[in-house]
Amino acid sequence: ILGGREAEAHARPYMASVQLNGAHLCGGVLVAEQWVLSAAHCLEDAADGKVQVLLGAHSLSQPEPSKRLYDVLRAVPHPDSQPDTIDHDLLLLQLSEKATLGPAVRPLPWQRVDRDVAPGTLCDVAGWGIVNHAGRRPDSLQHVLLPVLDRATCNRATHHDGAITERLMCAESNRRDSCKGDSGGPLVCGGVLEGVVTSGSRVCGNAKKPGIYTRVASYAAWIDSVLA
């Protein structure tokens, strides 16, 4: 998260750290007791490694009573996700067992009504991704409030040049932005999960390259079918 600040500890009980061989790889969001939603590209480099999900965490390194690391029983990338595109960049991870819920671990309601979030709406994005242009990774969860950007602006030739389909949404990226390591994390508007940070290799913090988020409402049928 660029230009953000440290989050209030455990105030986002839906927040997950998707980990590879014990190290933070991507963000994720608890959407059901046994399911975490993340980004499909996050697993591209994970073929030989052990993928786990950390819930109830604020600090990645410090002991916390609510922290628990879960093994992954099943990883379900969206069937249409591809390495070279940002489209359909969703991944569902089934935990080895139902998460122990409490004040610091709680699923987040997700948007099912397939309607664009109004431009200018302030949404919260959180993650353990890099926090500056040097590439420093934080130990504690960071967050930032970002205004939603209308699709027409985001699709300008100077911005994302038509790449933003109706199944994607954008948020402003002028110095405040999601970045490397935040992929798969939640974009929350009005207490509801609206988007998932895409994991394309995008310049961060540049106003001309807005953040791109996968609209979960557009994938409601797929999410429901996997969770069923």
Epitope: I130, G135, K180, S201
Partner: antibody
């Protein structure tokens, strides 16, 4: 544990080029930015530039533009610094860094005929 | 480009003494990093984002400042702190380092 292993010292002739390597272990270079910094006794520490290994995007200090080229090979978790048209002014120790936090041991480059 | 001037260039301190060195920028910068370099070694990150201690750095080190004026303080000098200290700014490209403060032990 994060480690950056740099290639060995180089003695090169004026006008030649040299390519230094830095192999990372303990993390995937695609998940951060990698930097190169030079150190000369009379000039101190100077930031040369950085690369985003995930997409190859680079940014340089203008004074090193044309002199330095930073590349990355994600399959071997290695970043490279190529220095061209070398002069005695380029004699220095060159460090690679992960996120400006973890430094390699440095590679000494001496330009001499 | 942002020019960073460190002062003093050389200083010495006795064990247990408090040490403060400064880094002045010719234009306002938002954050400062500090590095320690012992003779024959690579630099090591001490302080990031002006005042945050890097992993494994003793709590006797602290950083502060804003705008054009930043400082690094060692609350009680120890022999192993004899080194050269560099500041670095991240606000504007190109990122620049100060010329260093060499700290010797008395």
């Amino acid at each position: 544990e994060v480690q950056l292993q740099q290639s060995g010292a180089e003695l090169v002739k004026p006008g030649a080029s040299v390519r230094l390597s830095c192999t990372a272990s303990g993390f995937n270079i695609k998940h951060t930015y990698m930097h190169w910094v030079s150190q000369r006794p009379e000039r101190g520490l100077e930031w040369i530039g950085k690369i985003d290994p995930a997409n190859g995007n680079t940014k340089y200090d203008p004074k090193f533009q044309g002199k330095a080229t930073i590349t990355a090979d994600t399959s071997s978790n290695t970043v490279y610094l190529q220095l061209s048209s070398l002069t005695s002014e380029d004699t220095a120790v060159y460090y690679c860094l992960n996120a400006m936090e973890y430094w390699g041991q440095g590679t000494s480059v001496t330009v001499s005929s | 480009q942002s020019v960073l001037t460190q002062s003093p260039a050389i200083m010495s301190a006795s064990p247990g003494e408090k040490v403060t060195m400064t880094c002045s920028a010719n234009s306002s910068v938002s954050d400062m990093y500090w590095y320690q370099q012992r003779p024959g070694s690579s630099p090591r990150l001490l302080i990031y984002d002006t005042s945050n201690l890097a992993s494994g750095v003793p709590v006797r080190f602290s950083g502060s400042g804003s705008g054009t004026s930043y400082s690094l303080t060692i609350s009680r000098m120890e022999a192993e702190d004899a080194a050269t200290y560099y500041c670095q700014q991240w606000s504007t490209y190109p990122w620049t380092f100060g010329g260093g403060t060499k700290l010797e032990i008395k």
